[in-house]
Interface confidence: low
């Protein structure tokens, strides 16, 4: 089933992200949404990311025989983020432009930040209903990629162990205990 409607929004949330994080820092970003400064505070490697495109998508879910009773609304994170220097004196002499052009093997991309798991009911042709679990994106963020990262990760940001799919226990109905949920 095709999307019935897609509405493009632009994220105006300012998210400071280190431009040269260590690999560990990159992984940790997935846990806190990238909202942190480098250890040295605001230095010349700190960038503010704006312009992350959040596409609101409305679609029906099908498993081939059954179709969702109501359409599903979710966010689709798209596009590259526009990098802007944090400190005002970076803007004047074209330094920022040169800085970024020298790093053509790097790019900032808009990727999934937060997800929520929910249950949806599908109506079947024979009158019965089925319930499925799905994960929908609820927020986007900017993430720095290198060309090597792109090739090795198959373009799946959340393939990194820092941002796995939620523990199965968390995907169960709310009436069940959540003692096994991941920290």
């Amino acid at each position: 089933f095709k999307n019935d409607a897609t509405e493009i929004l632009y994220s105006h949330v300012v998210k400071p992200v280190p431009a040269h994080p260590s690999s560990n820092s990159t992984l940790n970003q997935a846990r806190n949404g990238g909202r942190h400064f480098s250890n040295t505070g605001l230095d010349r490697n700190t960038r503010v990311q704006v312009g992350c495109r959040e596409l609101r998508s409305t679609k029906y879910i099908s498993d081939g025989q059954c179709t969702s009773i109501s359409p599903l609304k979710e966010l689709v994170c798209a596009g590259e983020c526009l990098p802007l220097p944090v400190l005002p004196n970076w803007i004047g002499g074209g330094y920022g432009t040169k800085y970024w052009s020298r790093r053509s093997s790097q790019e900032w991309r808009c990727v999934n930040d937060k997800t929520r798991t929910q249950r949806i009911q599908l109506q079947c042709q024979d009158g019965s209903t089925r319930t499925y679990k799905i994960t929908v994106v609820t927020a986007c963020k900017c993430k720095r990629y290198t060309r090597q990262h792109n090739e090795s990760s198959h373009n799946f940001e959340s393939m990194s162990p820092a941002k796995p799919v939620q523990h199965h226990r968390e995907r169960k109905r709310a009436s069940k205990s959540s003692k096994h949920s991941m920290s």
């Epitope: 099908s62 999934n112 499925y132 679990k133 799905i134 940001e157 959340s158 799919v165 096994h180």
Partner: antibody
């Protein structure tokens, strides 16, 4: 009707890798968990891991950590399972399966026989 | 990992018989137990999920019950087409695990 169609049988040498594909049709691929389950000849079923196609998020059985990689290509509605450092005991039929809401498997691929032999 | 112990490992019964297979978990699995039927050379097929729910299209002679750690799968009246191996599977904790299987034969 949902269908999961897997790639053909493979014969591999010990130490090599194998990549099995699973093409889904008839459903919304991005909103599904695809698991991989294997079955050695005459043996039971063993869950290897899953991928959530919408985000690429994965979880693996600890037994296979470091050797198995599950990926997905939304554009072709295809999931992949790659197993490296193959040994003779990896000889098995490998199934992809689509999860229902609470972790049972509603649809299965036809299976791919991987034979590891020198 | 949660261990599932199925019994018996094999059984022989006559057409029309009531057949019972048990599955014991090494810890409470909160009723997240499903049952599969597998015929030779074929992929497994889910019959029962969440302990007692019959999957769409599965004959009503198949049923499941239990709670906590002890679960039972029943075929109320065995049919020739029921000859297969049956597996239980827990989905309460990762990794998902299966019982070792029960091979069902006709006398």
């Amino acid at each position: 009707q949902v269908q999961l169609v897997q790639s053909g049988a493979e014969v591999k040498k010990p130490g090599s890798s194998v990549k099995v594909s699973c093409k889904a049709s008839g459903g919304t691929f991005s909103s599904t968990y695809i698991s991989w389950v294997r079955q050695a000849p005459g043996q039971g079923l063993e869950w290897m891991g899953w991928i959530y196609a919408g985000t690429g998020g994965t979880r693996y059985n600890r037994k296979f950590t470091g050797r198995v990689t599950i990926t997905a290509d939304e554009s072709t509605s295809t999931a992949y399972m790659e197993l490296s450092s193959l040994r003779s005991e990896d000889t098995a039929v490998y199934y992809c399966a689509r999860e229902g809401v609470d972790g049972w498997f509603t649809y299965w691929g036809q299976g791919t026989l991987v034979t590891v032999s020198s | 990992d949660i261990q599932l112990t199925q019994s018996p490992s094999s059984l022989s019964a006559s057409v029309g018989d009531r057949v019972t297979i048990t599955c014991q978990a090494s810890q409470d699995i909160n009723n997240y137990l499903s049952w599969y039927q597998q015929k030779p050379g074929k992929a497994p097929k889910v019959l029962i999920y969440d302990t007692s729910n019959l999957e769409t299209g599965v004959p009503s002679r198949f049923s499941g019950s239990g709670s906590g750690t002890d679960f039972t799968f029943t075929i109320s009246s065995l049919q020739p087409e029921d000859i297969a191996t049956y597996y239980c599977q827990q989905s309460d904790n990762l990794p998902y695990t299966f019982g070792q299987g029960t091979k069902l034969e006709i006398k």
